[in-house]
């Protein structure tokens, strides 16, 4: 297992509809055609995967279904998309890149990106 | 070195706007955020709220919701704070910090030198 | 919102002696989401702990942060001249941002 550098941004406050995106960047040593991206979620010292890809280069991201996270890539850039946030879920949200295919093994994991999420305030009564 | 450098003084009349710069140099400045406090004469600190330079989302203070807008140049790492339909209770030093995260640990580590704005007839 | 309380409102004590500041959350505030900052006249607020207890860069050992919870603690350990300010905490685990109203240490 070799060692990568994966970078994101530091900090992110979700739209108001509770919709985080961020890039996570990593610098490929190699012509990497298989790559696998985890987004792990870190609160209180407890570490949770929140969605997780593979792709072929060249292609789009799969995720399962029910996955709140979307995704695009473009080189060695994955552009992610998480939704269906809370104020409950803000927390520091990791990335973390594998390239599986083809040898040697590489794993990168990036500083985590803190996603601040505001519960939008409820709409007053209105009488009609 | 980081460093926040905020625009002069301003003398404003009830009612109209200012609007406030901050210039940071020194680091990515969209990776990180930005927050707006003021400080009205012989007062405590209060927080106005903070704009994620990434994406330019924007939190605001309740109290301010309706007259404040925080906005980012992103090509010369600059923000702005604007605030509108101003008072006299408005009269404050404003400054702007950066919102820091690292480990999953948020602060305001630099600060700008703060902008006096009156307000006055 | 979480409401953030100081006490006391103002200490008054003499150069050597240990300066212990207390600030309360309304509701269970994150330790890695506490802050502290010393604010002199005519400045700009400095931090001096961040996660509730580590030290920011070039901050003496004199100051220490702890708690968990609900309530935090910034101890000045042998207060120096240039300790006489005003200290305030803020919570970043949740918007808005508050800050606490702040504990004047002046000298006696």
């Known amino acids: 297992c070799k060692a990568m550098h994966v970078a994101q941004p530091a900090v992110v406050l979700a739209s108001s509809r509770g919709i985080a995106s961020f890039v996570c960047e990593y610098a490929s040593p190699g012509k990497a055609t298989e790559v696998r991206v985890t987004v792990l979620r870190q609160a209180d010292s407890q570490v949770t995967e929140v969605c997780a890809a593979t792709y072929m280069m060249g292609n789009e991201l799969t995720f399962l279904d029910d996955s709140i996270c979307t995704g695009t890539s473009s080189g060695n850039q994955v552009n992610l998309t998480i939704q269906g946030l809370r104020a409950m879920d803000t927390g520091l949200y990791i990335c973390k890149v594998e390239l599986m295919y083809p040898p040697p093994y590489y794993l990168g994991i990036g500083n985590g990106t803190q996603i601040y999420v505001i519960d939008p305030e409820p709409c007053p009564d209105s009488d009609f | 070195q980081v460093q926040l450098v905020q625009s002069g003084a301003e003398v404003k009349k009830p009612g109209a706007s200012v609007k406030v710069s901050c210039k940071a140099s020194g680091y990515t400045f969209t990776s990180y955020g930005i927050n707006w406090v003021r400080q009205a004469p012989g007062q405590g600190l209060e927080w106005m709220g903070w704009i994620s330079a990434y994406n330019g989302n924007t939190n605001y203070a309740q109290k301010l919701q309706g007259r404040v807008t925080m906005t980012t140049d992103t090509s010369t790492s600059t923000a702005y704070m604007e605030l509108r339909s101003l008072r006299s209770d408005d009269t404050a030093v404003y400054y702007c910090?950066?919102?820091?995260?690292?480990?999953?640990?948020?602060?305001?580590?630099?600060w700008g030198q703060g902008t006096l704005v009156t307000v006055s007839s | 919102e979480i409401v953030l309380t100081q006490s006391p409102g103002t200490l008054s004590l003499s150069p050597g002696e240990r300066a212990t500041l207390s600030c309360r959350a309304s509701?269970?505030?994150?330790?890695?989401?506490l802050a502290w900052y010393q604010q002199k006249p005519g400045q700009a607020p400095r931090l001096l702990i961040y996660?509730?207890?580590s030290r920011a860069t070039g901050i003496p050992d004199r100051f220490s942060g702890s708690g968990s919870g609900t309530d935090f603690t910034l101890t000045i350990s042998r207060l120096e001249p240039e300790d006489f300010a005003v200290y305030y905490c803020?919570?970043?685990?949740?918007?808005?941002?508050?800050f606490g109203p702040g504990t004047k240490v002046d000298i006696k």
């Open positions: 996660g509730a207890s």
């Open positions: 509701q269970s505030v994150s330790s890695s989401y």
């Open positions: 910090a950066r919102l820091y995260c690292s480990g999953g640990s948020c602060y305001s580590d630099y």
């Open positions: 803020q919570q970043y685990g949740s918007s808005p941002f508050t």
